[in-house]
Interface confidence: low
């Protein structure tokens, strides 16, 4: 039901849901630090703009008694319980930051009259697409799907001369929250990815995956999986792999490939890694010292959520417009704002756009090298290395179906 908002008379509050069930196992203290760092920046920006207002955050913690799995499985009710808590206390801010779990976001969106914007660090699933007052600051599954279809169809690059129309997807149910929804989207029979592919089979057992690597009767040479190199090694080990197998490892929120002196292990030679172009300024900021590279994106999304709110607040205040209106709630999309480490672009549906990067392992240097980049905003691929030192024959990616000639 409708809750009055603490959002007027020069005082603007942000409600931050601190849920025990989270897309990433990040200590809530680190997220608090990220939010507080964001608040400092917002206050400075508003002051510089001559806007003498107060901006604060209220952290809403759940009791954690019932919903304590720690992952997203029991997040649906936790989100609604927190909303009830806000409602009872009449403590709703101008904007709601969190939740990060797809289940809880979907349910909260359904069960509330959203006259306020909701900003999420996560909510990766397709069920959270196209929500009018929801903004997602980490790449959702739809963006991954569009890249994969674009890449599958590409056939005019020196290193990729075949269109692909087939794939295996490895999904064993132990994935992290982001991977779970990414693979879920690829598995869904009604998704864009499934619609565009002629053949797609989900491998659910380790043995199924391992058998495909050398199976002469396999229906596709391409296997998509999600996780880090260690996850792949646990599954693949040092097993022999047919020379025309291509493993696409989706590992978006992992900066380790870009660190100096990183050498790619031998088992990565048949692998293309899809990750995000790294940020730059989190390396030595106060709140990120305790974060692993894989957690930076999550904390950064919270921080950027605060900066996004500050950006919109500034625009509305400068235009003399009311904050507690549907117009404000629907405004958090189709824009670029100054994020913590550079411009952040949101698409027409409030989802973050980014530069995805496809890496390969150079057989010469054993380093990860950039094969191409992909701009999710314009759905366009930019080739980077025109003569890659691949493990594959003739330094070209193989056809997706063995024995099929040029198309």
């Amino acid at each position: 039901s409708q809750v009055s908002q603490n959002c007027h008379n020069g005082s603007y509050e942000i409600s931050v849901l601190m849920m025990g069930n989270s897309a990433f196992a990040e200590p809530l203290k680190n997220l608090e630090d990220a939010v507080n760092e964001g608040l400092e920046i917002v206050r400075g920006r508003l002051q510089n703009a001559g806007l003498n207002v107060t901006v604060n955050a209220t952290f809403m913690y759940s009791d954690g008694l019932i919903h304590n799995s720690g992952d997203c499985r029991s997040s649906t009710c936790e989100g609604l319980d927190l909303l009830r808590k806000i409602s009872n206390a009449q403590r709703m801010g101008c904007v709601l930051i969190g939740p990060s779990c797809t289940y809880s976001t979907f349910q909260m969106y359904l069960d509330t009259e959203l006259s306020y914007p909701m900003i999420s660090a996560g909510s990766f699933g397709l069920s959270c697409d196209y929500k009018e007052t929801l903004t997602r600051l980490m790449s959702p599954a739809r963006k991954l799907m569009y890249f994969l279809v674009n890449f599958w169809k590409t056939n005019d690059l020196p290193f990729k001369t075949y269109s692909w129309s087939t794939s295996y997807v490895y999904k064993n149910g132990t994935e992290t929250e982001d991977c779970f929804w990414y693979l879920n989207a690829l598995e869904a029979s009604v998704s864009y990815f499934s619609h565009e592919l002629g053949f797609k089979v989900v491998l659910r057992q380790d043995k199924e995956f391992q058998d495909i690597l050398m199976d002469h009767n396999r229906k596709s040479n391409v296997i998509i999986m999600c996780g880090g190199p260690e996850f792949l090694y646990k599954l693949k080990g040092d097993r022999a792999v047919a020379e025309d197998i291509v493993i696409i490892l989706v590992d978006l929120f992992n900066d380790q490939y870009f660190e100096d002196n990183v050498t790619a292990p031998d088992y990565m030679k048949n692998v293309l890694v899809l990750t995000l172009s790294p940020g730059n300024s989190l390396l030595n900021s106060s709140f990120s010292r305790n974060l692993s590279p894989t957690k930076r994106d999550f904390a950064l999304a919270y921080l950027n959520g605060i900066l996004l709110f500050g950006h919109m607040l500034k625009i509305f205040l400068e235009n003399g417009e009311n904050i507690t209106t549907p117009k404000f709630a629907h405004a958090f999309r189709n824009l670029t704002f100054e994020g913590y480490d550079g411009p952040v672009t949101l698409d027409d549906w409030g989802d973050v756009d980014s530069t995805m990067v496809l890496l390969y392992t150079s057989v010469d240097t054993k380093k990860y090298k950039v094969l191409l980049t992909y701009d999710t905003h314009v759905n366009k691929t930019y080739p980077v290395d025109m003569s890659p030192t691949f493990t594959w024959k003739n330094s070209k990616l193989p056809n997706d179906i063995t024995g099929r000639g040029p198309q």
Partner: nanobody, 133 residues
Framework: QVHLVESGGGVVQPGRSLRLSCAAS????????RGWFRQAPGKEREGVAT???????SYADSVKGRFTISQDNSKNTLYLQMNSLRAEDTAVYFC???????????????????????????WGQGTTVTVSS
């Protein structure tokens, strides 16, 4: 090899503005960042501003707040809007394209004009900007 052609230079009074353009042709697929550099008479070439493929801009401290770098990917053109020009901005301005396939190049820190190593960079011929009353 990428062919870069700068234009828009000229003589301008202090405090006025100028906009430089740089048209790129040839293969630009390995571009990870483009930028503007300048070389004043008797001085070393220095970074002014850079912009990554995804649009992240960085500036040398001496031009921050006065200069704006932008790009139009559809026209393959780079721009430098120079406002509040000063006498010390007098120099030959070069457009540059940084090309490398190493993953580490995508780190925007390594694309900052102050930190940019000049290996793997294609240069234009330069356009002269003179700020004088």
């Amino acid at each position: 090899q990428v062919h870069l052609v700068e234009s828009g230079g000229g003589v301008v009074q202090p405090g006025r503005s100028l906009r430089l353009s740089c048209a790129a042709s040839g293969y630009t697929g390995r571009r990870l960042c483009r930028g503007w550099f300048r070389q004043a008479p008797g001085k070393e070439r220095e970074g002014v501003a850079t912009i990554t493929l995804s649009g992240r801009a960085s500036y040398a401290d001496s031009v921050k707040g006065r200069f704006t770098i932008s790009q139009d990917n559809s026209k393959n053109t780079l721009y430098l809007q120079m406002n509040s020009l000063r006498a010390e901005d007098t120099a030959v301005y070069f457009c540059a394209e940084v090309r490398s396939a190493d993953a580490e190049w995508l780190n925007p820190l390594k694309c900052h004009p102050d930190r940019l190593g000049l290996a793997g960079v294609d240069w234009g011929q330069g356009t002269t900007v003179t700020v004088s009353s």
